[in-house]
């Protein structure tokens, strides 16, 4: 899909299994043509996506794409949940698909569940 619109490359229903206490970077790959858009992260709370105001973010620039990164330093248990990035471009709001973080508590890290066990336990999101 080639165009000069801003495009946000987060896969639909993408998932990550991460460990509380570890650092983690959640990337929002952004393609744009001229001016870099203003990008933000939000966390889903039901059907509402709550903007993450006071979180550390940064940009990483590569040849064909840029990454707007949300930093977790460290990951906390309540970071569990679904996140979305959004870009403001020519007065349009472009929203990514949501991506889900499954956080395993460091206390039980020795019995850390597999990615598939995490995926089968949607209650961890609530």
């Amino acid at each position: 899909k080639e165009s000069c619109d801003v495009q946000l490359y987060i896969k639909r229903q993408s998932e990550h299994s991460i460990l509380a206490g570890d650092p983690f970077e959640l990337e929002c790959p952004v393609k744009y043509c001229a001016n870099r858009p203003h990008v933000t992260w939000c966390k889903l709370n039901g059907t509402t996506c709550v903007k993450l105001e006071d979180r550390q973010t940064s940009w990483k620039e590569e040849k064909n794409i840029s990454f707007f990164i949300l930093h977790f330093e460290p990951v906390l248990p309540n970071d569990n949940g679904s996140y979305r990035c959004s870009a403001n471009f020519q007065s349009n709001l472009i929203e990514s698909h949501s991506t889900t973080l499954y956080v395993t508590d460091v206390k039980s890290a020795s019995e850390r569940p597999s990615k598939d066990e995490m995926a089968s336990r949607p209650w961890l999101l609530y």
Partner: antibody, heavy 119, light 112 residues
Framework: QVQLQESGPGLVKPSGTLSLTCAAS????????MYWVRQPPGKGLEWIGR????????RYNPSFKSRATISADKSKNQASLKLSSVTAADTAVYYC????????????WGQGTLVTVSS | DVVMTQSPLSLPVTLGQPASISCRSS???????????LNWLQQRPGQSPRRLIY???KRDSGVPDRFSGSGSGTDFTLKISRVEAEDLGVYYC?????????FGQGTKLEIK
Amino acid sequence: QVQLQESGPGLVKPSGTLSLTCAASGVNIKDTYMYWVRQPPGKGLEWIGRIDPANGYTRYNPSFKSRATISADKSKNQASLKLSSVTAADTAVYYCAVYDGYYESFDVWGQGTLVTVSS
Amino acid sequence: DVVMTQSPLSLPVTLGQPASISCRSSQSLLDSDGKTYLNWLQQRPGQSPRRLIYLVSKRDSGVPDRFSGSGSGTDFTLKISRVEAEDLGVYYCWQGTLFPRTFGQGTKLEIK
């Protein structure tokens, strides 16, 4: 264009492990989801599971009761399926397929491999 | 699991005439992003399935415009405006909204 090539043994012994590989061309698999579907002779389609090759995250059909393992090798641009403790009921054509993870803009199936479970 | 129910399971048609296949899901396929992930596949005899329609009504590239998809929520339809010989085979609906992904039983389109 996107193409898939499955490979693996066509005959597996009961209680053994079925192993198939699916090599992709025309696309970088990290931008996709890859999945496996099977079709017993003369019957319909059954979804086995999928992988996000970018991070290895998998989803399975619970009916396979942890017998299925899907993996991906980004450096080889391929995915694999292993199905353990097979019985005659696992005899089927096994298809791998790939689709665009961002926009669903393509969905391509391999040619399928008939795997027979028999001693 | 979401149960996908197709009807009819066998559809005898006359070449040049229209055909219609129904697909019902046991729960809504409307995703949280506002899109409905309902696909239609065609499987010609001896061949692999290929996607014809995605997101209910979008045709894949190379799919003739005699194929159209419609519907919402739990009720979906695939229509062929004028059946041609190359259209014969089995058609499957399947959902990509919820895990595990599930398929309809298939509808066999055959010559009357």
